[in-house]
Amino acid sequence: VPLSRTVRCTCISISNQPVNPRSLEKLEIIPASQFCPRVEIIATMKKKGEKRCLNPESKAIKNLLKAVSKEMSKRSP
């Protein structure tokens, strides 16, 4: 569950559940910073624009990131 705060981490809970890359509208990867000491991954789904915080340590999520970056490299000229 994401939560909007300025000087805090965004994610309150995280999911290990894999996400179908085709159902993704957007995938945000927020690097660790002075505001939040951990990497955060926020998936926005096409359906209703629903968001989900993903666990960067989860194997399923790591595979998702690989699949998405593969897809992006295909699209880039």
């Epitope: 569950v1 939560l3 909007s4 994610c11 309150i12 809970s13």
Partner: antibody, heavy 121, light 109 residues
Amino acid sequence: QVQLVESGGGVVQPGRSLRLSCAASGFTFSNCGMHWVRQAPGKGLEWVALIGFDGINEYYADSVKGRFTISRDNSKNTLYLQMNSLRAEDTAVYYCARDWPEGYYNGMDVWGQGTTVTVSS
Amino acid sequence: EIVLTQSPGTLSLSPGERATLSCRASQSVSSSYLAWYQQKPGQAPRLLIYGASSRATGIPDRFSGSGSGTDFTLTISRLEPEDFAVYYCQQYGSSPPFTFGPGTKVDIK
């Protein structure tokens, strides 16, 4: 099965302290934000505090800010609420509840049975 | 701080009847952040509806939620004996506090 069990309630004098615990089982506790919610006798529900899955984020209701501290020990699958400077108006049933992570906001989907705190001289 | 108002305070109905419960917010709430709970005497609350209109796991389809902005509704299409309880709405906005409404009691006429 998925379960939350609160403990630590009791009768305490005004100005004293009490620590509540909430033992979680049946799910990946370390992935879930956790809440404390209370209910005074014959009254409605009042959100008290929230802690993020890794303890970085903490949020409090104005009525308890500066007096209550929420914390967690993921190695023990346990949530805590340290309550200091207790007042008569803190008398309530205290529930811990899970913040469900598999969506944007799926509400508090698992609740404990509650533990009763009575502040009285 | 967003304040939630629920109406009516008490709803007296008979089994089989339709119940319509209202929850009004003092300022706009994203529908993603509105939930409904049921509470029976001596029990913990139970999540019924999240995201204003999605039923939680195991909740019968006689329960439905709707609304957006500042006005939200919980509808119980046909009241069963086990549905007589207190119902709370709750908002989970972009920052705490995550306020609950004062509740609507549905009792047997």
